[in-house]
Each structure stands twice: as structure tokens, then as C-alpha cells.
């Protein structure tokens, strides 16, 4: 099936300039979606503290081709990878240089996806095989989430056992597009 094919085949990673050239971690079988701007799902972060806005984590942009078996996307798609351990935003940039590397005490914070989006992708296949159209989920933003030992195990499936499952959040509606717009729209990705 397509998911397995993506994990096995989609290895052509093109880091954007200014980002680290390491490949993103293996994507797990996760799923988080965005909610309507006017919809009935408010942000829901039950394990976060009031000052969670003071915590920061890194969003790495990667551009990759999506593959499904022998078929590859006509255009690369840009995705975010949530990287690093969360720390107080004011300490992250120069913390090491000052010798004040932040160590968490108490609850653990992890950098995990906050919102996802769906994107249409056209896959071109070799040997005259007909192209395929698929929709993929891509990370739209990252956040710091506080983990506690009371987390349900089902919430720790996404990124190994170190991260809680992200929630869907709100996002602004992208520009309208026709039903035919199935190729990766990198100009509006982020």
C-alpha cells in the first residue's frame, strides 16, 4: 500500500538553503488535521502549562519527492520536520555559548507537529503507466507539548515513544483552487 511505499521509497530529500542537511526522522503512521477557522474545534492542549508560549522548538523545512511504488511526484513537496528538545525561547539561541544549557526539570517537553494540511500530489509512473493522483498529509507547524507520565500510550505512537500525538488546530484557509489543481503547490506551502 501507499504508506509503506512512501516509507521505503521516498528518500530523495532536498534540504532548503539555510537548514540542516540531515534527513528528517522516519515518518510514522500519524494523522493530525487542521480545523475550520469558523469550525467547532478549538485548540485543545490539556497537558500544557500557562507559560508554554515561552517554549520554542525548531521547524526544519525539507523538500522531497513523494513516491508510491515506482511512481514519483511530478513536483517535490515541502514539509516541516519538528526538531530538537523544547526549551525556554529566550535561552535557546545562545544558551550553549553562555554555558547555561537549559535542562528540563519536572515535566518533559517535546517538539512535535501542531497542525497538518492535506496536499494534492500527481505521481508520474514509468513505462507508460497512467499517472496517479493522491493526497498526502504534511506538517504545517510545530509546537512544544508537555509530556507527563500519565500520558496514554496511544498518544505516544507518532514519533517513537518520546512525543505525544499532536492535535488538530486552526489554520487560515489557503487561496481557492480548482478541482484540477492536483500538483504540489509549493508557492503556498508555508
Amino acid at each position: 500500500q501507499g504508506w509503506q511505499a512512501f516509507k521505503n521509497d521516498a528518500t530523495e530529500i532536498i534540504p532548503e538553503l539555510g537548514e540542516y542537511p540531515e534527513p528528517p526522522p522516519e515518518l510514522e503512521n500519524n494523522k493530525t488535521m487542521n480545523r475550520a477557522e469558523n469550525g467547532g474545534r478549538p485548540p485543545h492542549h490539556p497537558f500544557e502549562t500557562k507559560d508554554v508560549s515561552e517554549y520554542s522548538c525548531r521547524e526544519l523545512h525539507f523538500t522531497r519527492y513523494v513516491t508510491d511504488g515506482p511512481c514519483r511526484s511530478a513536483k517535490p513537496v515541502t514539509e516541516l520536520v519538528c526538531s530538537g528538545q523544547c526549551g525556554p525561547a529566550r535561552l535557546l539561541p545562545n544558551a550553549i555559548g553562555r554555558g547555561k544549557w537549559w535542562r528540563p526539570s519536572g515535566p518533559d517537553f517535546r517538539c512535535i507537529p501542531d497542525r497538518y494540511r492535506a496536499q494534492r500530489v500527481q505521481l508520474l509512473c514509468p513505462g507508460g503507466e497512467a499517472p496517479r493522483a493522491r493526497k498526502v498529509r504534511l506538517v504545517a507547524s510545530c509546537k512544544c507539548k508537555r509530556l507527563t507520565r500519565f500520558h496514554n500510550q496511544s498518544e505516544l505512537k507518532d514519533f517513537g515513544t518520546e512525543a505525544a500525538r499532536p492535535q488538530k488546530g486552526r489554520k487560515p484557509r489557503p487561496r481557492a483552487r480548482s478541482a484540477k489543481a492536483n500538483q504540489a503547490e509549493l508557492e503556498n506551502a508555508y
Epitope: Q1, G2, W3, F6, K7, L27, N29, N30, K31, T32, M33, N34, R35, A36, E37, N38, G39, G40, R41, H44, D68, Y116, R117, A118, Q119, R120, Q122, A130, P131, R132, A133, R134, K135, V136, R137, S154, R165, Q167, K168, R170, K171, P172, R173, P174, R177, S178, A179, K180, N182
Partner: antibody, heavy 121, light 109 residues
Framework: EVQLVQSGAEVKKPGASVKVSCKVS????????MHWVRQAPGKGLEWMGG????????IYAQKFQGRVTMTEDTSTDTAYMELSSLRSEDTAVYYC??????????????WGQGTLVTVSS | QAVVTQEPSLTVSPGGTVTLTCGSS?????????PYWFQQKPGQAPRTLIS???DKHSWTPARFSGSLLGGKAALTLSGAQPEDEAEYYC?????????FGGGTKLTVL
């Protein structure tokens, strides 16, 4: 594995409203894009609306706009579909359906057992 | 709103092959409509057989396949079994809004 359990059968009078619930287990509701489909007795399936992750909003079928409201209670992982100004032709089995939990976006992979709504005076 | 058309009924012999089609009032069905196919048996909820034109699911028997054929979406059943007798629905994606076809009653005789 995603499981959807819907509320029980309802009998309503014309002009009234009905609110059908769909309880999610296996995953949290926030991880799923919920859609609602109905089927009148002896008839085909009819899409009523659902969450569109491409645009980040709930889209309603033109036929039901202004009469249907789809909401969610994330604290209980329960989705709701409310249909107002009921008429006899709204008598149907109402299904909730969600996508799969994978990299590829596939809608309508998991279905509730259906809720029969009868509209009769 | 678009209208999606299917054959009202089809009959196939056990072991035989049959193709169900799905057309759109707006023109040819393409991969950009992400055609879905569902099977529904009496008293049961539908279940997905095919997504995105041709993508089978783990529970879809190998004898079912999806494709595009002459401007329509098609579901082909090769080697029909008695248990394949059911109603089959196609669904097309019109830019985030979906429309079901009227369904095809498939009889295995």
C-alpha cells in the same frame, strides 16, 4: 483501529431538529476528518458534508447548507450532526465516517453503524 | 451540483468478469476526481473497496480493481463470487465536496 459508535434511533416530527452523535475510539477525534452520509430507505448514499483538510474547514453539500451543522466535542471525542427543519424525506439512516490514519489521505475508511432518523407526524 | 451516474443493475455469472462504471455530468472523470468505490450489503454500513481511482485497501479482495475507462471511473470484478452480490457506489471528489453515484445492484447468478 478507529471505531465509531453512533447514537440510537430517533423519531421526530416535521419541522423539528435532530442531533446525531458519533463517538470515536481508538484514536482521538482531533486526529480524524469526519464526514456524514445518509441513506433513505431503499435509496442510495448521499454525502452531507465533512471536514476538508485541504482548506481547513468543514464543507457542507449544497443541498443541506443552512439546515445542517456539524460540530465536535473534543473532550469526549464525539462528533455531532444536527439537521433542522425536518421533513418526511429526511427519514434515513445517518452514518458518520472518518479517514484512515496514514500518510496518504483516504476518506470514508471507517464507518459508524448508522442511526435511523424517522420523521413522521 | 454535479450528478454522478452508475448502471442501476448488472448481473454476472460466478467466476465471470463484470465492469461497473461511474460517470460525471460535468464531463470526463479523471484522476483529479479521486474516485472511490464502496460495497454495501443489506443491513450493513458501506465499506471502501477502492480509493483514488485504483488504490486498494488491505481488506479489498484481489479480484476487485479500479481504473479509468473511456472518461469514466470503472470498478472491475474478475472471478465473481456469490458473496460479491451487493450494491456498489462510486464517489467523486469535486474539490473537497463529494457526490455519490446512484449505486449499481450487482447480482451474481
Amino acid at each position: 483501529e478507529v471505531q465509531l459508535v453512533q447514537s440510537g434511533a430517533e423519531v421526530k416530527k416535521p419541522g423539528a431538529s435532530v442531533k446525531v452523535s458519533c463517538k470515536v475510539s481508538g484514536y482521538t477525534l482531533t486526529e480524524l476528518s469526519m464526514h456524514w452520509v445518509r441513506q433513505a430507505p431503499g435509496k442510495g448514499l448521499e454525502w452531507m458534508g465533512g471536514f476538508d483538510p485541504e482548506h481547513g474547514e468543514t464543507i457542507y453539500a449544497q443541498k443541506f447548507q443552512g439546515r445542517v451543522t456539524m460540530t465536535e466535542d473534543t473532550s469526549t471525542d464525539t462528533a455531532y450532526m444536527e439537521l433542522s427543519s425536518l421533513r418526511s424525506e429526511d427519514t434515513a439512516v445517518y452514518y458518520c465516517a472518518t479517514d484512515s490514519v496514514s500518510f496518504w489521505e483516504k476518506f470514508f475508511q471507517h464507518w459508524g453503524q448508522g442511526t435511523l432518523v424517522t420523521v413522521s407526524s | 451540483q454535479a450528478v454522478v451516474t452508475q448502471e442501476p443493475s448488472l448481473t454476472v455469472s460466478p467466476g465471470g468478469t463484470v465492469t461497473l462504471t461511474c460517470g460525471s455530468s460535468t464531463g470526463s472523470v479523471t484522476i483529479d476526481h479521486y474516485p472511490y468505490w464502496f460495497q454495501q450489503k443489506p443491513g450493513q454500513a458501506p465499506r471502501t473497496l477502492i480509493s483514488d481511482t485504483d488504490d486498494k485497501h488491505s481488506w479489498t479482495p484481489a479480484r476487485f480493481s479500479g481504473s479509468l475507462l473511456g472518461g469514466k471511473a470503472a470498478l472491475t470484478l474478475s472471478g465473481a463470487q456469490p458473496e460479491d452480490e451487493a450494491e456498489y457506489y462510486c464517489l467523486l471528489d469535486y474539490g473537497g465536496s463529494f457526490v455519490f453515484g446512484g449505486g449499481t445492484k450487482l447480482t451474481v447468478l
